[in-house]
């Protein structure tokens, strides 16, 4: 028999972590699976916004470019649009995902500055301008959101909300990377994070779960796009490398 | 409170250039905003002539670029208009204004030029 | 050039009446209108911004409406010193452009 559970890998049964583990787990439900994604955009350059009517410019990082911006929230969207089969019946990331507002908004918690737009294309192209100037715009948006990510409304004329679909806030930290001190207009980096419901004793719906995150793998891996660089993992990431390794070692 | 101020000539001949200059107080018009002409002819009539950006980008009414031209004094705060060659037709007020994010929110008082020989 | 039209030159009302100023622009300008109010021998006064936004200190017995070609200032019940002009502004597309204005009277 080969053991591909971290868990039972790396934990003695009776060490006191297994045991609290096994506790919290079977009172308040285990902790979520997480299926994230790291995304560049190593083609890009960093651009510069002037925000009208004052104020110094603002340096913004490759991958808060518009046009990036949308790339992303496409895959994103793509990726929301994942179904699985697990015992004949068809898996989507609506039937595993957090959903805390769940039954009164069913939206899935996704993590993600696409977030502070609602996934929205149009939220993301909404803008106050004229031929000279902009006065507001997802620049303007963003840097109000991650200074007030649970805003109903950014103060701007876009009078835009910040909250997630979910019904909660994205904070910033947890959805940009490679920004220095608290300039997350300089990130080089998106980080994408889809929580998943997880499971004690009950084998069938984490056997769904996992069926849609071997879907979710396979996708992102022969996903094709020259302008982004994903680094991704899913939560069943671990196990199938100890699978592969276990199978290769028995051969 | 922010104010502007226009001066210049009360008559200019045809053909002649006309410089006007406005004052601001209360901001510097290089800390923000963009600082913009227009112009009101007898009948009431306006007309919007150009801009200096507080970056110190420029735009000019297509309709005035050959002989328009503005400039500014930042150490004096003062931005200005020159017209060339100008005629009956150039007959106006003169009004500078800042361009909010909304629309012309601080205006001058008017400086009232006639072009007439 | 986007051309604004004002089609009354003149509006005739009473203290206490409801009238609706109307600006239409020659082509699709979106919200980007602004209306402004001048008093005899004053400088025009901004009133409302993006088509129905009411600037700061302006009563809110004038609300603006509209999109696209079709503009309106509506004053629900006019005061005495609401004898003005009042222009339309398009700063959507470059030159910028007003309306020729519209003369509001009280009998």
């Known amino acids: 028999r080969v053991t591909t559970n971290p868990v039972d890998l790396w934990s003695a049964p009776s060490s006191q972590a297994r045991l609290e583990k096994e506790y919290f787990d079977q009172h308040f439900g285990p902790f979520f699976r997480t299926e994230q994604l790291i995304i560049r955009a190593p083609l890009t350059d960093k651009h510069i916004y002037q925000p009208y009517p004052s104020g110094a410019d603002v340096p913004f990082g490759p991958p808060l470019d518009i046009q990036i911006l949308h790339q992303v929230l496409d895959l994103q969207i793509a990726i929301e649009n994942i179904t699985a089969s697990y015992d004949n019946e068809t898996v989507t990331l609506q039937d595993i995902c957090l959903a805390p507002l769940s039954p009164y908004n069913t939206n899935c918690t996704i993590l993600s500055v696409l977030n502070y737009f609602q996934n929205s294309h149009s939220v993301l192209d909404h803008k106050k301008g004229d031929d000279f100037f902009v006065y507001a715009d997802y620049h303007t948006h963003f840097l109000y959101c991650v200074r007030a990510p649970a805003s109903l409304n950014d103060t701007s004329l876009l009078h835009d909300p910040c909250l997630g679909t979910f019904g909660g806030p994205v904070f910033p930290w947890l959805v940009l990377g490679g920004y220095d001190d608290q300039n997350y207009n300089n990130a080089t980096a998106l980080v994408i994070t889809f929580p998943v419901n997880n499971y004690y004793n009950d084998t069938e719906k984490l056997q769904r779960a996992q069926a849609w995150e071997k879907e979710f793998i396979n996708f992102v891996k022969n996903y094709k796009n020259p302008n982004l660089t994903i680094s991704f993992t899913a939560e069943r990431s671990i196990e199938d490398e100890l699978n592969r390794e276990s199978d290769s070692d028995v051969f | 409170d922010v104010q502007l101020q226009e001066s210049g000539p009360d008559l200019v001949k045809p053909s002649q250039s006309l410089s006007l200059t406005c004052t601001v107080t209360?901001?510097?018009?290089?800390?923000?905003?963009?600082w913009h002409w227009i112009r009101q002819f007898p009948g009431n009539r306006l007309e919007w002539m150009d801009y200096?950006?507080?970056?110190?980008?420029?735009n000019y009414n297509p309709s005035l670029k050959s002989r328009i031209s503005i400039t500014r004094d930042t150490s004096k705060n003062q931005f200005f208009l020159q017209l060339n060659s100008v005629t009956t037709e150039d007959t106006a007020t003169y009004y500078c204004?800042?361009?909010?994010?909304?629309?012309?929110?601080?205006w001058g008082q008017g400086t009232t030029l006639t072009v007439s020989s | 050039d986007i051309v604004m039209t004002q089609s009354h030159k003149f509006m005739s009302t009473s203290v206490g009446d409801r009238v609706s100023i109307t600006c239409k622009a020659s082509q699709d300008v979106n919200t980007a209108v602004v209306w402004y109010q001048q008093k005899p021998g004053q400088s025009p006064k901004l009133l409302i911004y993006?088509?129905?936004t009411r600037h700061t200190g302006v009563p809110d017995r004038f609300t603006g409406s509209g999109s696209g070609t079709d503009f309106t200032l509506t004053i629900s019940s006019v005061q005495a010193e609401d004898l003005a002009l009042y222009y339309c502004?398009?700063?959507?597309?470059?030159?910028?452009?007003f309306g020729g204005g519209t003369k509001l009277e009280i009998k």
């Open positions: 502004q398009q700063h959507y597309t470059s030159p910028w452009t």
């Open positions: 200096i950006h507080y970056s110190g980008s420029i």
């Open positions: 209360g901001y510097s018009i290089t800390s923000g905003y963009s």
């Open positions: 204004a800042r361009w909010g994010a909304t629309g012309f929110d601080y």
């Open positions: 993006w088509a129905s």
